[in-house]
């Protein structure tokens, strides 16, 4: 599922925010590494936040992390466990608009 909505009715003509590709769903095996990609572009450069099951993702040293990429953001989970199952959502904002995309990890 993907959604987009305006925060401000007076958008700068130069500003934009685009979800370039819906987030990937992933089915994988225990102990493997999974990567979820949030592909967005915008001006000003968007801030991206990650959520799992409607809650901010909790980073775990050496196991679960997210970082900015040239295309947006990447969430990586190493040593996958059954406890990781759920809905993952990235939310991006450029301060005026918001876009989001959701993927499932099973």
């Amino acid at each position: 599922p993907t959604s987009s909505w305006n925060i401000s009715s007076e958008l700068n003509k130069d500003s934009y925010l685009t979800l370039d590709e819906p987030m990937n769903n992933i089915t994988t095996s225990l102990g493997q590494t999974a990567e979820l990609h949030c592909k967005v572009s915008g001006n000003p450069p968007p801030t991206i936040r990650w959520f799992k099951n409607d809650a901010p993702v909790v980073q775990e040293p050496r196991r679960l992390s997210f970082r900015s990429t040239i295309y947006g953001s990447r969430l990586r989970i190493r040593n996958l466990d059954t406890t990781d199952t759920g809905y993952f959502q990235c939310v991006a904002t450029n301060g005026k608009e918001v876009v989001s995309s959701t993927g499932v990890l099973f």
Partner: antibody
Framework: EVQLVESGGGLVQPGGSLRLSCAAS????????IHWVRQAPGKGLEWVAT????????SYADSVKGRFTISADTSKNTAYLQMNSLRAEDTAVYYC????????????WGQGTLVTVSS | DIQMTQSPSSLSASVGDRVTITCRAS??????VAWYQQKPGKAPKLLIY???SLYSGVPSRFSGSRSGTDFTLTISSLQPEDFATYYC?????????FGQGTKVEIK
């Protein structure tokens, strides 16, 4: 309108089998996690099993692993719980429930079906 | 599995009272906690999700909050229809796990 309707409960002897059904309507069945949650008489809620039919993925509570099987028929928008080797401690009301579109909470529940395991 | 320790197990209150129920998670569950209301012979009903978001159609006298791994359900002014059992649930880690329940009875 979203609806979940369970059926198939009843009285069964220890060691016996039963199959519960959860008929869903009002939403795209294959896009959601569907769960079975049970409640023993006078007790709290216990998660039993989960399926996401799009991925054909399942998970189980340790207490039922190897005895219960969750499945789904997307053509019928129905989830099933096949319960084998039933024990007295499996006696409970069994509810099916759906997860919210972005996960987490169970937003819709069925009315429940009672399973009694007794000789 | 994550343990959700709910307290109290029961409480007596009067119509109009402010009621608070708490749940403590055994480890971080972010803000992925939901609260349910259940009446005898009925299925649970979702009240709060994501620790503090009010579910559609739920009266505004219900509210939820989070402080670290402690979660609170508050009923600001208890109504006759609120006498029921309440459960918390963590949904961050699979499997979902529930608190033991709090029965709210008439004083």
């Amino acid at each position: 309108e979203v609806q979940l309707v369970e059926s198939g409960g009843g009285l069964v002897q220890p060691g016996g089998s039963l199959r519960l059904s959860c008929a869903a309507s009002g939403f795209t069945f294959s896009s959601y996690f569907i769960h079975w949650v049970r409640q023993a008489p006078g007790k709290g809620l216990e998660w039993v099993a989960t399926i996401h039919s799009y991925f054909d993925g399942t998970s189980y509570a340790d207490s039922v692993k190897g005895r219960f099987t969750i499945s789904a028929d997307t053509s019928k928008n129905t989830a099933y719980l096949q319960m084998n080797s039933l024990r007295a401690e499996d006696t409970a009301v069994y509810y099916c429930a759906r997860t919210r579109p972005t996960g987490g909470a169970f937003d819709y529940w069925g009315q429940g079906t009672l399973v009694t395991v007794s000789s | 599995d994550i343990q959700m320790t709910q307290s109290p197990s029961s409480l007596s209150a009067s119509v109009g009272d402010r009621v608070t129920i708490t749940c403590r998670a055994s480890q971080s569950v972010s803000s992925a906690v939901a609260w349910y209301q259940q009446k005898p012979g009925k299925a649970p009903k979702l009240l709060i999700y994501s620790a503090s978001s009010l579910y559609s159609g739920v009266p505004s006298r219900f509210s939820g909050s989070r402080s670290g791994t402690d979660f609170t359900l508050t009923i600001s002014s208890l109504q006759p229809e609120d006498f029921a059992t309440y459960y918390c649930q963590q949904a961050y880690w699979s499997p979902a796990t529930f608190g033991q329940g709090t029965k709210v009875e008439i004083k």
